[in-house]
Interface confidence: medium
């Protein structure tokens, strides 16, 4: 339905407020380190004229595309060359080659200082003063660090922000109100923002086919009574959504997304019984509440899988009539009868059927080549369960800091030329599929644990694509997407690393640690294991845990001390000497 | 609404030394932080002090420039020495330490340095 008017008819669309607030993300997102102050220029003009165009759409430049529009709004910015470099360039070309210019400049890392969090007596009061700036000033801070955060979803964000200073500030412990609600808002904000960085991966690395696979298969486990058609609409519609947001075209994406929730809303009888409450919610929730419902229960008496993909005699006909419709059934078909299976596991399951078919559909006898393929799923299918259930009897054995670091460990030796901040941020990460996932039941693990995983190990594709320094993070970051995690675990120690020199600077320690939060000191010590891995990769478990066991203890003695900066100089110097001593560098 | 306002700049020779002053009205807020922003250039970060008085410094200004606060009389200080003609800039301050602003900009106060 073309307008004449695509800037009016998404303001009409959206209303001024989410206009504004998205087309501040969107220039947040692409000129990263841009003053908040000058955004909000560029927003309120771009808003200004798209009120002219309300009024009148056949007004001057109001038939311009928004990438039009917007990239000219951005391509004003008097010290673009001077503070983006080479992305000034992006500017001298025509859409839509612009837009695809400012999109490969998004930084996944920018050198933006970290959030530091002032006391709470400050926030509630810019928070009073000023209650609109503050709220944009949210949405830009974290735009500007997360350059793929899903646009509608931080408009969520930001209204549970809101909703936590209005309550919280009124308190009579505003902390103890206030504080906890930011540490849940921080926290899923950080996983939104990873999640949505996978499906722009996906789509941007591996294209439109590999993102819609994954879609049907998690939504054939979440909606396992829907049709097959009701699923492949939702798929299409979902890949549009996702398409524009990742896109740049958040006015678009941000559309979009509430005529799906109101489309699924107004058919939830023939999509899950799950969504009632969803649906009873104002939009922002409506459509979170959506994107999280859980799986609906499985119809009753489902057929066995083996009868239309393997006995039938029409597969290969089947197949050959139309590839992708046959595979996306088998997916569908599998995927709904499998709520206790990753998504990543079920799309290698159908490239395996893929593969099988194409080979078999062209031999003398289709049938008999292709009757045993289930049985290529076994081993698929318990790799995974393994691994999981290792590595939470692991977990279960160390707890979660203990654990981070026997991964620490393992990817400082698969991989040690990334970057130490990278390793220990995705080991990190890593690590938290403990406390996430082990505690689930045997039928929830998996979907949980390897699901998690190639969001975390996607965190460190995007981080070492910037700048790359290991082919063999490149060859499993770049060769299949679903198969990312099983190269990764199928990696040995690199027998090609020569160990890095040994730097006592890297292991001098200050005072300041002592003021540190317990999770940044946990960084501080993990950042020192990673190091003297990358000194010693041949350092067994045992000589890594007795250096680290002496230097917690150092820490807290000096930490105790009465001169704190004289007892870390001088048992720093002790401890570096019998580290270096234990570990033989 | 929570008024910023700079004060102590002027006119020095290369070399020379001013002291800024930035005054919170209503309260002690923390972390503190100062800003400058040169002509035709972006404001950036110079100097910041925490919560805890831990202080951090623009590569630029290291050993020349100290942040200070006193928070009786609810200020923060510059102490700026050595004094070169880059410095030249209008100077803010703001809550929220390094890099981070979170109240509206005061109207800053000149710094010039030239022979």
């Known amino acids: 339905d073309a307008h004449k008017s695509e800037v009016a008819h998404r303001f009409k669309d959206l209303g001024e407020e989410n206009f504004k607030a998205l087309v501040l993300i969107a220039f947040a997102q692409y000129l990263q380190q841009c003053p908040f102050e000058d955004h909000v220029k560029l927003v309120n003009e771009v808003t200004e004229f798209a009120k002219t165009c309300v009024a009148d759409e056949s007004a001057e430049n109001c038939d311009k595309s928004l990438h039009t529009l917007f990239g000219d709004k951005l391509c004003t910015v008097a010290t673009l060359r001077e503070t983006y470099g080479e992305m000034a360039d992006c500017c001298a070309k025509q859409e839509p080659e612009r837009n695809e210019c400012f999109l490969q400049h998004k930084d996944d890392n920018p050198n933006l200082p970290r959030l530091v969090r002032p006391e709470v007596d400050v926030m509630c009061t810019a928070f009073h003063d000023n209650e609109e700036t503050f709220l944009k000033k949210y949405l830009y801070e974290i735009a500007r660090r997360h350059p793929y955060f899903y646009a509608p979803e931080l408009l969520f964000f930001a209204k549970r922000y809101k909703a936590a200073f209005t309550e919280c500030c009124q308190a009579a412990d505003k902390a103890a109100c206030l504080l906890p609600k930011l540490d849940e808002l921080r926290d899923e904000g950080k996983a939104s923002s990873a999640k949505q960085r996978l499906k722009c991966a996906s789509l941007q690395k591996f294209g439109e086919r590999a993102f819609k696979a994954w879609a049907v298969a998690r939504l054939s486990q979440r909606f396992p009574k829907a049709e097959f058609a009701e699923v492949s609409k939702l798929v299409t519609d979902l890949t549009k959504v996702h398409t524009e947001c990742c896109h740049g075209d958040l006015l678009e994406c941000a559309d979009d997304r509430a005529d799906l929730a109101k489309y699924i809303c107004e058919n939830q009888d023939s999509i899950s019984s799950k969504l009632k409450e969803c649906c009873e919610k104002p939009l922002l929730e409506k459509s979170h509440c959506i994107a999280e419902v859980e799986n609906d229960e499985m119809p009753a008496d489902l057929p066995s899988l083996a009868a239309d993909f393997v006995e039938s005699k029409d597969v290969c006909k089947n197949y050959a009539e139309a590839k992708d419709v046959f595979l996306g059934m088998f997916l569908y078909e599998y995927a709904r009868r499998h709520p206790d299976y990753s998504v990543v596991l079920l799309l290698r399951l159908a490239k395996t059927y893929e593969t099988t078919l194409e080979k078999c559909c062209a031999a003398a006898d289709p049938h008999e080549c292709y009757a045993k393929v289930f049985d290529e799923f076994k081993p698929l299918v318990e790799e995974p369960q393994n691994l999981i259930k290792q590595n939470c009897e692991l977990f279960e054995q160390l707890g979660e800091y203990k654990f981070q670091n026997a991964l620490l460990v393992r990817y400082t030796k698969k991989v040690p030329q990334v970057s130490t901040p990278t390793l220990v941020e995705v080991s990190r990460n890593l690590g938290k599929v403990g406390s996430k996932c082990c505690k689930h039941p045997e039928a929830k693990r998996m979907p949980c644990a390897e699901d998690y995983l190639s969001v975390v190990l996607n965190q460190l594709c995007v981080l070492h694509e910037k700048t790359p320094v290991s082919d063999r993070v490149t060859k499993c970051c770049t060769e299949s997407l679903v198969n990312r995690r099983p190269c990764f675990s199928a990696l040995e120690v690199d027998e090609t690393y020569v160990p890095k020199e040994f730097n006592a600077e890297t292991f001098t320690f200050h005072a300041d640690i002592c003021t540190l939060s317990e999770k940044e000191r946990q960084i501080k010590k993990q950042t020192a294991l990673v190091e003297l891995v990358k000194h010693k990769p041949k350092a067994t478990k045992e000589q890594l845990k007795a250096v680290m066991d002496d230097f917690a203890a150092f820490v807290e003695k000096c930490c105790k001390a009465d001169d704190k900066e004289t007892c870390f100089a001088e048992e720093g110097k002790k401890l570096v000497a019998a580290s270096q001593a234990a570990l033989g560098l | 609404q929570v008024q910023l306002v700079e004060s102590g700049g002027g006119s020095v020779q290369p070399g020379g030394s001013l002291r800024l002053s930035c005054a919170a009205s209503g309260r002690n807020f923390n972390p503190m932080g100062w800003f400058r922003q040169a002509p035709g250039k972006q404001r950036e970060s110079v100097a910041a002090?925490?919560?805890?008085?831990?202080?951090k410094y623009a590569d630029s200004v290291k050993g020349r420039f100290t942040i200070s606060r006193d928070n009786g009389k609810n200020t923060v200080y510059l102490q700026m020495n050595s004094l070169k003609s880059e410095d030249t800039a209008v100077y803010y301050c703001n809550v929220g330490g390094w890099g981070i602003s979170w109240f509206p900009w005061g109207r800053g106060t000149q710094v010039s340095v030239s022979s």
């Open positions: 002090i925490g919560t805890d008085g831990s202080t």
